[in-house]
């Protein structure tokens, strides 16, 4: 006869490990007892259990409550046992010693491999600002056994670098993603992808990029100067800019206080019916936590009567 077992048994942390040991004997041969022990080199041997054909399972004090027989139906030649709730410390060599009648004793060894799935964590780098050079966008760390694979999934152009730290029974892998921040990256996903044999599918953690910037400011509303004449209603100036975080707007008049009746509504400056006192230099001040910008325009409110008088003069002058 001979013993049938596996060279390697692989389980995920927390699962039950079936340690196989089957005696393939000739007809009439019987298994009297199976002894299971852990036999790591350098770690010392430790009995797990005795499996007696008549009296059943006797688990050693060190493994009490953790070793069971597989559920029925059971073959009397099957000396397999279940190691419940495998932990990382269970990883190692195991020996099955089988006492048979009349053939004598046989033994076989197997290696138990306990996969420890990683629990990845993603840490954003420092605040990203337009105009910076190559900057850390995020780092992703995953520790497991064996060492996990850490990669990045993104449309953003950047560079990655990885490092690994070996511990006694596991390895931690950290990958960093660096980029040159630009406003086009705002809102773009940066996804850390962790692969590991103990995972049914890759684990993904997504970070949304936020790049601080502030665009140049400009003022709209003065495209047609002829519309800015005395008596016109609904005249307004709108300050144009964009930024991250969203900017705030402030209006001032360079050559004095804002005239009475002028309404400030965020990026918009609304005028009452125009008079000549609304003529002046207006400044839009745009700011966010990252920067500030100014844009100024000159408003010249036309008096239609003056304009027509000038025209007559010009005509007669000709």
């Amino acid at each position: 006869g001979e013993l049938e077992t596996s060279d390697v048994v692989t389980v995920v942390l927390g699962q039950d490990a079936k340690l196989p040991c089957f005696y393939r004997g000739d007809s009439g041969e019987q298994v009297g007892q199976v002894a299971w022990a852990r036999v790591d080199a350098g770690e010392g041997a430790q009995e797990l259990a005795l499996l007696h054909s008549k009296y059943g399972l006797h688990v050693s004090p060190a493994y009490e409550g953790r070793v069971e027989q597989p559920p029925p139906p059971r073959n009397p030649l099957d000396g397999s046992v279940l190691l419940r709730n495998a932990v990382q410390a269970d990883e190692g060599e195991y020996e099955c010693r089988v006492s048979t009648f009349p053939a004598g004793s046989f033994q076989a060894r197997l290696r138990l491999r306990v996969l420890v799935p990683p629990l990845p964590s993603l840490n954003p780098g420092p605040a990203l600002e337009e105009g910076q050079g190559l900057t850390l966008a995020a780092s992703c760390t995953a520790e497991g056994s064996p060492a996990p694979s850490v990669t990045w999934d993104t449309e953003v152009k950047g560079t990655t670098s990885s490092r690994s730290f070996k511990h006694s029974r596991s390895a931690a892998v950290t990958s960093e993603f660096h980029l040159v921040p630009s406003r086009s990256m705002n809102g773009q996903p940066l996804t850390c992808v962790v692969s590991h044999p103990g995972l049914l599918q890759d684990q993904r953690i997504t970070h949304i990029l936020h790049v601080s910037f502030l665009a140049e400011a400009s003022v709209r509303g003065l495209e047609d100067q002829n519309l800015w004449h005395i008596g016109r209603e609904g005249a307004m100036l709108k300050c144009l800019s964009e930024g991250q975080p969203p900017p705030s707007y402030n209006w001032t008049r360079l050559d004095g206080p804002l005239p009475s009746g002028v309404r400030v509504d965020g990026d918009t400056l609304g005028f009452p019916p125009l008079t000549t006192e609304h003529s002046g230099i207006y400044v839009c001040h745009v700011s966010n936590e990252f920067s500030s910008r100014d844009s100024q325009v000159t408003v010249d409110v036309l008096d239609p009567q003056e304009d027509s008088g000038k025209q007559v003069d010009l005509v007669s002058a000709s």
Epitope: G44, Q46, E47
Partner: antibody
Framework: EVQLLESGGGVVQPGRSLRLSCAAS????????MHWVRQAPGKGLEWVAV????????YYADSVKGRFTISRDNSKNTLYLQMNSLRAEDTAVYYC?????????????WGQGTLVTVSS | DIVMTQSPSSLSASVGDRVTITCRAS??????LAWYQQKPGKVPKLLIY???TLQSGVPSRFSGSGSGTDFTLTISSLQPEDVATYYC?????????FGQGTKVEIK
Amino acid sequence: EVQLLESGGGVVQPGRSLRLSCAASGFTFSSYGMHWVRQAPGKGLEWVAVISYDGSNKYYADSVKGRFTISRDNSKNTLYLQMNSLRAEDTAVYYCAKDYGYNWNFFDYWGQGTLVTVSS
Amino acid sequence: DIVMTQSPSSLSASVGDRVTITCRASQGISNYLAWYQQKPGKVPKLLIYAASTLQSGVPSRFSGSGSGTDFTLTISSLQPEDVATYYCQKYNSAPYTFGQGTKVEIK
């Protein structure tokens, strides 16, 4: 056939030392824990010490701790018990016993024993 | 340390009688208990381990039971060759102490 043969017993004065040996045969000595158990004349069994199959772990009864040392030489298939600072109450037949496995700590084979008498 | 107490210390019974020896642990030891037989002038012999598992070659008239703190060795039909002292031993943790023994004689 498993055989365990103790030697080294005798009469010794209190405070002196003695070294017992146990020669093993008939099994793979290096795969089993080994124990010393003693029995005072007309008394019961008292577990004394254990050594693991590879010699890396040793445990002692409180009554002998610090005075007795258990050791083994797997290349010679031999178990030893070094007994120092002997006392009258150490008088007993000393048995070496084979562990049922690596470290089950019960005994399926016993030697014939060697008598140690501590007397002035 | 856990103390193992056997009772009775000695007993006398007739051939064919059913004999029961008890062993009590001062703390629970699950089923980590062995029984040994020591005939006069002989070395101890393993009878039972795991409280109830009969060692190979031991006659089936011997049986063991119990778990936790209370254990029993039973000889279903006492034979003349069973005259001996019987010891229980706990092996869950060091020290691996024995009971004080029970001497069995034939009436």
